[in-house]
C-alpha cells in the first residue's frame, strides 16, 4: 500500500509541477519593472520569454512578441531551451508514469516492467525539474546582473536639467512559479524512484529445487513468489504455507537485488 501511495503521490506532485513549469513558461511576468526608488510612472513594463508587455495606468495593455530569433540574447534562448526541454521530458515522464502506475492494469505487464517504467519516469521528472530550476535561475541571474548595471547607470546623459531614467527590471511572478514548479517536479521524480524500489520483484540468484517426497508431489520455491501483476492466471499468489496473509507491499519490502539506492 505504501508503494502505491508513494507512486501515486509522486505522480500527482510531478503533474502539478509540470503544469506549473508550462504555466511559468507561458507567463509574461518573468521580469517586471522595478517600482522601488523610481519616479512613479503611469506605465508598467513586464517581460516574458516570448513577448514584452506594457500596461498603462488607463487600463490598456499592449504586448509585442519577440518576432526575431537571431536578435535575442543567447541567455534568453538558453532559458527558452531549458524550459522546453523540461516540459517535453516532463510530458514524456507523465505518459510513461501513467502506464507504470500500480493501480492501473495493462495487459499482463509484470511488476518488473512497471518498476523500470516508474524509475524511467522518475528520472525524467528529476531532469525536467532540474531543467526548469536551471532555466529560471539563469534568467534570475541575468536580471540581477542587468539590475545592478542599470542602477550604476540610473541617470545617464544628465546634460543640464534633462534626466533619462533607465527602466530597471526585477523578479516577476513567473520566476517564483518556475522555482516552485521545478522543485515539485523534482520531488515527484524522487518519489517515483523511491516507489520503484518497492515495485521491483524479489528474486534470488539460485534456481528453484524440486523435492520429491513419497506420496505427495509438492514443489517448494525457496525464493518465495514473484510479485503478482494482478492479471489473468497468476491470481493465487499467496504462499499456502505462510502463517498469515501478507499484503503485496509488505512482502515486497524485503531487500532484493533490484533495490535502487
Amino acid at each position: 500500500m505504501a508503494v502505491t501511495a508513494c507512486q501515486g503521490l509522486g505522480f500527482v506532485v510531478s503533474l502539478i509541477g509540470i503544469a506549473g513549469i508550462i504555466a511559468a513558461t507561458c507567463m509574461d511576468q518573468w521580469s517586471t519593472q522595478d517600482l522601488y526608488n523610481n519616479p512613479v510612472t503611469a506605465v508598467f513594463n513586464y517581460q516574458g520569454l516570448w513577448r514584452s508587455c506594457v500596461r498603462e495606468s488607463s487600463g490598456f495593455t499592449e504586448c509585442r512578441g519577440y518576432f526575431t530569433l537571431l536578435g535575442l540574447p543567447a541567455m534568453l534562448q538558453a532559458v527558452r531551451a531549458l524550459m522546453i526541454v523540461g516540459i517535453v521530458l516532463g510530458a514524456i515522464g507523465l505518459l510513461v508514469s501513467i502506464f507504470a502506475l500500480k493501480c492501473i492494469r495493462i495487459g499482463s505487464m509484470e511488476d518488473s516492467a512497471k518498476a523500470n517504467m516508474t524509475l524511467t519516469s522518475g528520472i525524467m521528472f528529476i531532469v525536467s525539474g532540474l531543467c526548469a530550476i536551471a532555466g529560471v535561475s539563469v534568467f534570475a541571474n541575468m536580471l540581477v546582473t542587468n539590475f545592478w548595471m542599470s542602477t550604476a547607470n540610473m541617470y545617464t546623459g544628465m546634460g543640464g536639467m534633462v534626466q533619462t531614467v533607465q527602466t530597471r527590471y526585477t523578479f516577476g511572478a513567473a520566476l517564483f512559479v518556475g522555482w516552485v514548479a521545478g522543485g515539485l517536479t523534482l520531488i515527484g521524480g524522487v518519489m517515483m524512484c523511491i516507489a520503484c524500489r518497492g515495485l521491483a520483484p524479489e528474486e534470488t540468484n539460485y534456481k528453484a529445487v524440486s523435492y520429491h517426497a513419497s506420496g505427495h508431489s509438492v514443489a517448494y520455491k525457496p525464493g518465495g513468489f514473484k510479485a503478482s501483476t494482478g492479471f489473468g492466471s497468476n491470481t493465487k499468489n499467496k504462499k499456502i504455507y505462510d502463517g498469515g496473509a501478507r499484503t503485496e507491499d509488505e512482502v515486497q519490502s524485503y531487500p532484493s537485488k533490484h533495490d535502487y539506492v
Partner: antibody
C-alpha cells in the same frame, strides 16, 4: 456615447470643504482610470488627481496633496473629488476626464466652477 | 514633478500657413518597454473643455484631421499644423502622460495674423 457630467461646484469660503461628483455613462467605467483637471480663470490646465481603474492607486500633485481626495463608486459609475482646506488659488473650473490610450484624457466633462472667496 | 515647457506662448499665423509648437519635458517621456513617447497634445477653444488631438507623441486621435501631426522623442516634441484653418485658432497644450502627477505645458495660443 461617452458622457461625463460634473456637479457639486459653487461658492465656498477659504478653509471650507466641497465635494465634486462626476457621473459617467457610455463606457466601462470600472475598467477606466479617471482624472480631475482644473483650469483657473485665464490660466492653463493643471492635473489635480488621478485614480486607477482598480481603485488601488491615487495620485496628486504637491499643490493639493493632503487636502484633496479622489474616489470612485463603480456600482454608481461615479467619480468624486473631496476638497478640504480650500484656498483662493483653488478657484477654477474642475473637469472630470477619462484616460484612454497612451494615458491621454480622451473624454472630458463640461466642467463645474468652484469659487473660493470670503 | 515633471516640468513641461511650451514655446512660444502665442503664435500669430495666417490662414493656410504652417504652425509649429514646441514642447520640452524635464525628463524623458520615452518608455523603453514599447519605445513609445508618452506625450499628448490637446486643443482648447474658449468656453469648451480640451479636446484630445495626439497621443503617444505622434498618433492622431480618431476624427482629428491629418493636417495635425506630432513628432519628437525623449524630451523634445513638436506639434505641426500644416495648413491652418479658421477652426484651428485655439490654445494648444502638451501633457506628460508618463510620470505622476500628469503635468501640462503652459499652453500656446494660436491667433489669426
Amino acid at each position: 456615447e461617452v458622457q461625463l457630467v460634473e456637479s457639486g461646484g459653487g461658492l465656498v469660503k477659504p478653509g471650507g470643504s466641497l465635494r465634486l461628483s462626476c457621473a459617467a455613462s457610455g463606457f466601462s467605467f470600472s475598467n477606466s482610470a479617471m482624472s480631475w483637471v482644473r483650469q483657473a480663470p485665464g490660466k492653463g490646465l493643471e492635473g489635480v488627481a488621478t485614480i486607477s481603474s482598480g481603485d488601488s492607486y491615487t495620485y496628486y500633485p504637491d499643490s493639493v496633496k493632503g487636502r484633496f481626495t479622489i474616489s470612485r463608486d463603480n456600482a454608481k459609475n461615479s467619480l468624486y473629488l473631496q476638497m478640504n482646506s480650500l484656498r483662493a488659488e483653488d478657484t477654477a473650473v474642475y473637469y472630470c476626464a477619462r484616460q484612454g490610450y497612451g494615458n491621454a484624457l480622451d473624454y472630458w466633462g463640461q466642467g463645474t466652477l468652484v469659487t473660493v472667496s470670503s | 514633478d515633471i516640468v513641461m515647457t511650451q514655446s512660444p506662448d502665442s503664435l500669430a499665423v495666417s490662414l493656410g500657413e504652417r504652425a509649429t509648437i514646441n514642447c520640452k519635458s524635464s525628463q524623458s517621456l520615452l518608455n523603453s518597454g514599447n519605445q513609445k513617447n508618452y506625450l499628448t497634445w490637446y486643443q482648447q477653444k474658449p468656453g469648451q473643455p480640451p479636446k484630445l488631438l495626439i497621443y503617444w507623441s505622434s498618433t492622431r486621435e480618431s476624427g482629428v484631421p491629418d493636417r495635425f501631426s506630432g513628432s519628437g522623442s525623449g524630451t523634445d516634441f513638436t506639434l505641426t499644423i500644416s495648413s491652418l484653418q479658421a477652426e484651428d485658432f485655439a490654445v494648444y497644450y502638451c501633457q506628460n502622460d508618463y510620470y505622476y502627477p500628469l503635468t501640462f505645458g503652459g499652453g500656446t495660443k494660436v491667433e489669426i495674423k
